[in-house]
Amino acid sequence: ARNGDHCPLGPGRCCRLHTVRASLEDLGWADWVLSPREVQVTMCIGACPSQFRAANMHAQIKTSLHRLKPDTVPAPCCVPASYNPMVLIQKTDTGVSLQTYDDLLAKDCHCI
Amino acid sequence: ARNGDHCPLGPGRCCRLHTVRASLEDLGWADWVLSPREVQVTMCIGACPSQFRAANMHAQIKTSLHRLKPDTVPAPCCVPASYNPMVLIQKTDTGVSLQTYDDLLAKDCHCI
């Protein structure tokens, strides 16, 4: 159940997709990736207020218990709901190869 | 890739399964659930230090970028990797029914 997409904290403050530019050095990939040398990393960032983009029943429970016991139970967290594939040209023992990674870049976000 | 299960922050401080006792009132279910009247909610709580239980490549990237830009990129978050089903006896217009929920109780945790 993908709940409300209205952010009560103000525009852009709640869980959504962000793009962060990163070099191979930033990612710790410089010793095994040849291309691309800069990655536009898409990731899920932002707050998860009550029922905002709740991924499932578990997220709804978490919201309820966080309200009751904020020191014990954390609020739901903004994480990828799905991923986009990304292809890397990487070094191998014999030369180079193209490798597709399916769990590298976030496509869509929800709270869980 | 399920990375290291050794918690550098000390025993029990990192991402793991916790059990929280909750009443139907706590969960906001009192008006539609008949049983159980108390739920042992299993949820994922704890810190996600570098490479601890990294769910996938995205979690590894997030760790790297959080180290570089802690104010922009949050650390990975402790969320369910899988769920246990739970059966609720719930009120219906005509009486009661047994309903199985597959996304309610965490079974296993990882960082993402």
């Epitope: 040849l34 691309p36 040398r37 800069e38 536009q40 594939p85 870049l105 | -």
Partner: antibody, heavy 119, light 112 residues
Framework: QVQLQQPGAELVKPGASVKMSCKAS????EGWYIHWVKQRPGQGLE????????????NHAQKFQGKVTMTRDTSSSTAYMQLSSLTSEDSAVYYC????????????WGQGTTLTVSS | DIVMTQSPSSLSVSAGEKVTMSCRSS???????????LDWYQQKPGQPPKLLIY???NRAHGVPDRFTGSGSGTDFTLTISSVQAEDLAVYYC?????????FGGGTKLEIK
């Protein structure tokens, strides 16, 4: 089968704009960049810019500043390049090609769209 | 911008002969790990270009092994060990070391 499909030709009047399409199939559209390359009749190849379908971010050669706008529609796996204020200098074949990133070789090319700017 | 210069601009050889063509860049294309951001393309009449060699020496999928790329820094060579009639084309080198990506002027190969 991995391919990039482009319309064969466009005939446009000077001063007008044109929006060319490049439809990807046979691979995950958002996993690769789309680059655009210009080739004037009997001339060499000229890189125009790239579009990252995953984010919508673009980059183009300074020479084409104000001339080119690159967009994409992920629902139809199609990249677009719009050229504005057309002159005879814009008459050329325009190719789209895919690359792993901004700095990677172009392993698949479209057949090209021949743009003719004429009154 | 990096200027790419190819020579000769054209050459005519008989089938079975060995051919070499040169590509020179105005600055080094060498990056880490000893790879150069230099690719070679073949364009037959009335067709789009086709990738032959990427990252200075790696044959693209399906390219016959008579095509070989070599060189480093600013000087690169494409060698066709035994020219076939179907190799009639213009050959372009391209640098993707930095933006804007630039192509050489091409070498036109004619078969006697």
């Amino acid at each position: 089968q991995v391919q990039l499909q482009q319309p064969g030709a466009e005939l446009v009047k000077p001063g007008a704009s044109v929006k060319m399409s490049c439809k990807a199939s046979g691979y995950p559209f958002e996993g690769w960049y789309i680059h655009w390359v210009k080739q004037r009749p009997g001339q060499g190849l000229e890189w125009m810019g790239w579009n990252n379908p995953r984010t919508g971010l673009t980059n183009h050669a300074q020479k084409f500043q104000g001339k080119v706008t690159m967009t994409r529609d992920t629902s139809s796996s199609t990249a677009y390049m719009q050229l504005s204020s057309l002159t005879s200098e814009d008459s050329a074949v325009y190719y789209c090609a895919r690359g792993v990133g901004a700095d990677a070789a172009f392993d698949i090319w479209g057949q090209g769209t021949t743009l003719t700017v004429s009154s | 911008d990096i200027v790419m210069t190819q020579s000769p601009s054209s050459l005519s050889v008989s089938a079975g002969e060995k051919v070499t063509m040169s590509c020179r860049s105005s600055q080094s294309l060498l990056w880490k790990h000893g790879y150069n951001y230099l690719d070679w393309y073949q364009q037959k009449p009335g067709q789009p270009p086709k990738l032959l060699i990427y990252l200075d020496r790696n044959r693209a999928h399906g390219v016959p092994d008579r095509f070989t790329g070599s060189g480093s820094g600013t000087d690169f060579t494409l060698t066709i060990s035994s020219v076939q009639a179907e190799d009639l084309a213009v050959y372009y080198c391209m640098q993707s070391f930095e933006t804007p990506i630039t192509f050489g002027g091409g070498t036109k190969l004619e078969i006697k």
